[in-house]
């Protein structure tokens, strides 16, 4: 890749670690990183926020949108359809409250996160709130006998997976409640297991169970998931985060349930166990994107290997040009504290440096005391990390890995990104109907934000999944003359970019357009000075 001219223009982008960006080697690039070099205004990484009691009011949602939330995640492990319908309504009300100013309006996507095929324990002594203490070294019998479904205690524990005795062996580990409690199987019966408590603790009702290494044969899509997915179609959600995906056929089953009416919903597969990691390539091929769900993954595979899985999955998604989300415990301490730990700050930054398209908040925004601060913190860290990416090497590798193609859109995308580096462009403006042109540009990871202009609201919302895309929704009526309509949308993008501080008069931007109306015709790249 050609290096940018150091004297090129006066674009804001020059303060974005430009000295480091021009280094000849990765080590030299690291040596040149400068804590006093401010990042540009735009943040390229998407921020996904889980909505819960701490954040579901319209007022809080408005503030979260202002703070940088791009996607609202609804966790269907909890809550009724009525509860989630209300949340969706609130997200849309908050989003549309900014609609009066098309230049500052931000489309916010809605994501439905499925419960998935979970294994859960029964009720402790008939109560949803009761707890018992499991002592290290104690014997605990696991039973499938429904008589104990609501009568679990420190001696006997019922769980809802009927085949557990077939899939675990003597010596197998069983983890309960996010791995806080660990049991080792000592004896197997037809419908019971005798285990020893290896790691004790307080056990509550209906806790999740993990069976690392076991070939768990639960259906990919439970009856509850089916109803939830259909509810999602009815509610017009933009994406599904499909839990515990283990193989490609699981993804196809989700796609089948979404049906014809849900054809446009993106399926993001959550990789949460060893089988999912092992069969990653087939899952990636079947999915629209991937979520590195580090919570369950860290129980199902050794904790010290989670970072390897993260890097591998992000790398393969980047290579394939599919979006990847990094999730779980990113700013966990901010549930209770207004500032993250230094380790959490580094974790967010390193996810961005690894190449994640989006970063996610869970309890931080759903139930935490500082939801807005958590969003703002992710925004600030992501911006700094993006400035520190060694684009010289990254673009070179992405370009080399891309197959030779005669697809005009693909070729134009590569050229646009290269040109944007060469002339330090303030942005790349893309006119897109389906979003494909913008996705292809994003695949090559430009430093400049990609302002994707579309008239399709869902295209705009779904574009947040891709690193670098800043979607803007054009609501102006279509002009009769195609060239005039192109100019209208490009000018709209120019106004948005200037209002947002992405560039100013005299900077240059790259503009990508088609040669005729419709999808699939993007083939024209122009370098345009900002008027």
């Amino acid at each position: 890749m050609s290096k940018p001219h150091s004297e090129a223009g006066t674009a804001f982008i020059q303060t974005q670690q430009l000295h480091a960006a021009m280094a000849d080697t990765f080590l030299e690039h690291m040596c040149r990183l400068d804590i006093d070099s401010p990042p540009i205004t735009a943040r390229n990484t998407g921020i996904i926020c889980t909505i819960g009691p701490a954040s579901r009011s319209v007022e809080t949602l408005k503030e979260m949108i202002k703070s940088g939330m791009n996607v609202a995640r609804l966790n269907f492990s909890h809550g009724t359809h009525e509860y989630h319908a209300e949340t969706i309504k609130n997200v849309r009300t908050a989003t549309e409250s900014f609609a009066s100013d098309p230049i500052l309006y931000r489309p916010v996507a809605v994501a439905l996160d499925t419960k998935g095929p979970e294994i859960r324990t029964g009720l402790i002594k008939g109560s949803g709130t009761a707890e018992v203490e499991l002592k290290k070294g104690a014997t605990l019998k696991i039973t499938l006998d429904n008589a104990y479904m609501e009568k679990c205690d420190e001696n006997i524990l019922w769980l809802d997976y009927k085949n557990i005795c077939k899939v675990v062996e003597v010596g197998s580990k069983i983890y309960v409640d996010d791995g806080l409690i660990s049991l080792q199987v000592k004896q197997k019966g037809a419908d019971f297991l005798v285990t020893e408590v290896e790691n004790g603790g307080s056990l509550g009702s209906k806790k999740g169970v993990n069976l690392p290494g076991a070939a768990v044969d639960l259906p990919a899509v439970s009856e509850k998931d089916i109803q939830d997915l259909k509810f999602g179609v009815e509610q017009d959600v933009d994406m599904v985060f499909a839990s515990f995906i283990r193989k490609a056929s699981d993804v196809h089953e989700v796609r089948k349930v979404l049906g014809e009416k849900g054809k446009n919903i993106k399926i993001i597969s959550k990789i949460e166990n060893h089988e999912g990691v092992r069969r990653f390539d087939e899952i990636l091929e079947a999915s629209d994107g991937i979520m590195v769900a580090r919570g369950d993954l860290g129980i199902e595979i050794p904790a010290e290997k989670v970072f390897l899985a993260q890097k591998m999955m992000i790398g393969r998604c980047n290579r394939a040009g599919k979006p990847v989300i990094c999730a779980t415990q990113m700013l966990e301490s901010m549930i209770k504290k207004p500032r993250p730990t230094r380790a959490e700050g580094s974790d967010v930054a390193n996810a961005v440096l690894d190449g994640a398209d989006c970063i996610m908040l869970s309890g931080e925004t759903a139930k935490g005391d500082y939801p807005l601060e958590a969003v703002r913190m992710q925004h600030l860290i992501a911006r700094e990390a993006e400035a520190a990416i060694y684009h010289l090497q990254l673009f070179e590798e992405l370009r080399r890995l891309a197959p030779i193609t005669s697809d005009p859109t693909e070729a134009t995308a590569v050229g646009a990104v290269e040109a944007s580096f060469k002339c330090c462009s303030g942005a790349i403006i893309v006119l897109t109907k389906s979003g494909r042109s913008a996705h292809q540009v994003a695949r090559y990871r430009p430093r400049a934000p990609i302002i994707a202009v579309t008239r399709n609201p869902q295209t705009a919302r779904q574009a947040h999944l891709y690193r670098g895309i800043f979607p803007v929704l054009c609501k102006d009526p279509v002009q009769e003359a195609w060239a005039e309509d192109v100019d209208l949308r490009v000018n709209f993008a120019m106004n948005v970019g200037k209002a947002r501080g992405f560039f100013k008069k005299g900077d240059v931007v790259i503009v990508l357009t088609g040669w005729r109306p419709g999808s699939g015709f993007t083939n024209t790249m122009r370098v345009v000075p900002v008027p």
Epitope: Q227, L229, K230, F231, G232, V233, E234, H252, E253, R255, K256, V257, G259, E260, K261, G262, K263, N264, K266, I267, D288, S434, R436, S519
Partner: antibody, heavy 116, light 111 residues
Amino acid sequence: EVQLQQSGPELVKPGASVKLSCTASGYNITGTYMNWVKQRPEKSLEWIGRIDPANGDSLYDQKFQGKATITADKSSTTAYLQLSSLTSEDSAVYYCAFDYGGHNWGQGTTLVTVSA
Amino acid sequence: DVVLTQTPLSLPVSLGQPASISCKSSQSLVYSNGKTYLNWLQQRPGQSPKLLVYLASNLESGVPDRFSGSRSGTDYTLKISRVESEDLGVYYCVQSYTHVPFGSGTKLEIK
């Protein structure tokens, strides 16, 4: 388990109208499209049209425009097919189906038009 | 509208032998998400149709693995590796890419 229960057989006079029903149980129909399909004896399946029960939008094969009207009632999770100006050509089995993973089918309703 | 052309209209086959049904589409059924919106249905005599294969090549749960679906461009094929008596009936290709979905059907009968 999702099931589609269709109304019983109909014996009707030529020129009359008829309204067939299809009720989904264990399922909220607004998350899918409901299709109606015609099958004459020993013949292939013919698509009549479909409805989006969430908003009432319907779509018909040109051949059935003016002949068929598809409606839905969200609250009772029921879809309806009304056929007007019946002739012997309309005698067939009518199926409701939704794309619940590429179609869940009702058991079919037999319609026979008979002269007085 | 998409036109699905199914061949043959009738397929006499001996039990235990393989069978192959073809369906040609007048246009691509690959949607923008990269998936192929073509399914195969089976209709046994006197029964409602039932889903066999979805998204061109995925077997519906409970369907025997002697059935398989494949795609080559706009040509789709349903194969039965060894025909059994319960397989007799009419097979339809059906697309959910756009409306007017059905092929003309192929009747599988015993030779």
